[in-house]
């Protein structure tokens, strides 16, 4: 993971200011309201398990 202002996060991840690291966009299916999900270009998350 890298600090903001350096190289971007790898494909499929997005920078989380809250957690101070790159986070997996795939986790937005479970936690769509996470702030870093705004930086994920994937299609809207599918309905989650619960």
């Amino acid at each position: 993971e890298q600090a903001p202002g350096t190289a971007p996060c790898s494909r499929g991840s997005s920078w989380s200011a809250d957690l101070d690291k790159c986070m997996d966009c795939a986790s937005c299916r479970a936690r769509p309201h996470s702030e870093f999900c705004l930086g994920c270009a994937a299609a809207p998350p599918a309905p989650f398990r619960l």
């Epitope: 101070d20 997996d24 966009c25 795939a26 986790s27 479970a30 936690r31 619960l50």
Partner: antibody
């Protein structure tokens, strides 16, 4: 660095109770969902319970086999979480691991603690 | 519950060769974008260690000798070239729904 330090476990009689604890350090504990996973030769790795974060209203989920018997809880102010186990039976015997997940995979793991239910 | 079936149960591979472990889910664990399948390595006396997340994404610090592939119901973990240190039991796990379930494990021995 990230650490999950477990305590509790040991020998307990059938029908008895036990409380496991896990203290976290090195990551933003309050943002993560926390789980207990157990392992036995008979059942392999088995997810037991999960407690989500404040933003998810501290929702809890349990494996069907422990519903009504086990209670998971957390204390974000002290970066710790717990598993209260009641009415224990022989099939609850195993190694219990605490683990953290942001959403999907079990990222960090405790060292494991043994629970033996036997008379 | 989603049943995870791992094959083979045990595997012996010569040093430097390829180890292939398969995991089949009883229903699809993929969307059009991501697969909710993860792989772990466990050595005796230690907790499991995350190797691969979301079917093919290598966890930070894990050697590139490890790779994952698959979607839907069928997934594969490859290790190439295998090293002595890879002697361990490997598990798959889905996070499609609750309950999360694990495969029965594959014990890898290096010849």
């Amino acid at each position: 660095q990230v650490q999950l330090q477990q305590s509790g476990g040991g020998l307990v009689q059938p029908g008895g109770s036990m409380k496991l604890s896990c203290i976290a350090s090195g990551f933003t504990f309050s943002s993560y969902w926390m789980s207990w996973v157990r392992q036995s030769p008979e059942k392999g790795l088995e997810w037991v319970a999960e407690i989500r974060s404040k933003s998810d209203n501290y929702a809890t989920h349990y494996a069907e086999s422990v519903k009504g018997k086990f209670t998971i809880s957390r204390d974000d102010s002290k970066s710790r979480f717990f598993l209260q186990m009641n009415n224990l039976r022989a099939e609850d015997t195993g190694i219990y691991y605490c683990s953290s997940t942001y959403a999907d995979y079990f990222h960090y793991w405790g060292q494991g603690t043994d629970l033996t239910v036997s008379s | 519950d989603i049943v995870m079936t791992q094959t083979p149960a045990s595997l012996a591979v010569s040093l430097g060769q390829r180890a292939t472990i398969s995991c089949r889910a009883s229903q699809s664990v993929s969307t059009s974008t991501y697969s909710y399948m993860h792989w772990y390595q466990q050595k005796p006396g230690q907790p499991p260690k995350l190797l691969i997340k979301y079917a093919s994404s290598l966890e930070s610090g894990v050697p590139a000798r490890f790779s994952g592939s698959g979607s839907g119901t069928d997934f594969t973990l490859n290790i190439h070239p295998v090293e002595e240190d890879d002697t361990a039991t490997y598990y798959c796990q889905h996070s499609w729904e609750i309950p999360y379930t694990f495969g029965g494990g594959t014990k890898l021995e290096i010849k």
